[in-house]
Amino acid sequence: VSHAGMINPEDRWKSLHFSGHVAHLELQIRVRCDENYYSATCNKFCRPRNDFFGHYTCDQYGNKACMDGWMGKECKEAVCKQGCNLLHGGCTVPGECRCSYGWQGRFCD
């Protein structure tokens, strides 16, 4: 018995039927990516983390979903206090507004 064709990774089971002269064979097949791997070819890596290399969870497609307070492609950039003037201030941890030299105030404005 042989079968040629694509079976994409998913949670559902796929039924394959084979009929011979004296027997009928039904197979239930499920292909699943290894943990932390995604996509049809299981080559997209996403492992949730919450440290200096990224603050994110992974959606069902393996895309990084930033945790509250973090942004950017790798979710490494902190979201500063709302209203912080980013021309004259910034932050390395969420919710702060640290002023550049020569600027002051709650929003560095």
């Epitope: 932390n36 983390r49 969870t57 390395t92």
Partner: antibody
């Protein structure tokens, strides 16, 4: 048994280049970060940079940005630190370390370290 | 960058003593602090991660606590093999930064 083995250190002149290797074994290379940490003679620890071998994401300390490049060969389970435009202040023992993380915890920890390789920048 | 300031920079203690090392972050780092032990000529060893979790294989006399900006490493009963230098490290935001180290010497 988890092992990290550094190689490639030595004496180099200021402005020169050197490539360090970190050969990993005993664990799934793509499931962890590999970081480089250095220690100047008689001084403390300084993070140099790191890589996530699975996706190639890298980050660097400001002191080496633009001069050092970290890469990984997943077929060889090896990480590399390419050091260019070396300065006297880059003289240190360079360690590679595995960084383990778990989203249930805030932060991470470098749980396995290599033995270190000495890089001396001097004329 | 976030500064990690350890105190004291060195201390002398006897076997059996309770030893406390503190680490202060220049900004809030939640509980993202690890502690390492290093002996001369050797690589550092992880003791504590996420401020208070004991790493596998580390003796229970080591403990960590703290959150925000103030953190503590405690050795409840100092043993001969504990004489070493200890480093704290924040891993909350890039770049990860280490404290300057605390050398624990024999009194």
């Amino acid at each position: 048994e988890v092992q990290l083995v550094e190689s490639g250190g030595g004496l180099v002149q200021p402005g020169g280049s050197l490539r360090l290797s970190c050969a990993a074994s005993g664990f799934t290379f793509t499931s962890y970060d590999i970081h480089w940490v250095r220690q100047a003679p008689g001084k403390g620890l300084e993070w140099v940079g790191g890589i996530s071998p699975a996706d190639g994401d890298t980050d660097y300390a400001n002191s080496v940005k633009g001069r050092f490049t970290i890469s990984a060969d997943t077929s060889k389970n090896t990480a590399y630190l390419q050091m260019n435009s070396l300065r006297a202040e880059d003289t240190a023992v360079y360690y590679c370390a595995r960084n383990d993380y778990d989203v249930r915890f805030v932060g991470s920890g470098m749980d396995y370290w290599g033995q270190g390789t000495l890089v001396t920048v001097s004329s | 960058d976030i500064q990690m300031t350890q105190s004291p920079s060195s201390l002398s203690a006897s076997v059996g003593d309770r030893v406390t090392i503190t680490c202060r972050a220049s900004q809030d780092v939640s509980t993202a602090v690890a502690w390492y032990q290093q002996k001369p000529g050797k690589a550092p060893k992880l003791l504590i991660y996420s401020a208070s979790f004991l790493y596998s294989g580390v003796p229970s006399r080591f403990s960590g606590s703290g959150s925000g900006t103030d953190f503590t490493l405690t050795i409840s009963s100092l043993q001969p093999e504990d004489f070493a230098t200890y480093y704290c490290q924040q891993s909350f935001t890039a770049p990860p930064t280490f404290g300057q180290g605390t050398k624990v010497e024999i009194k």
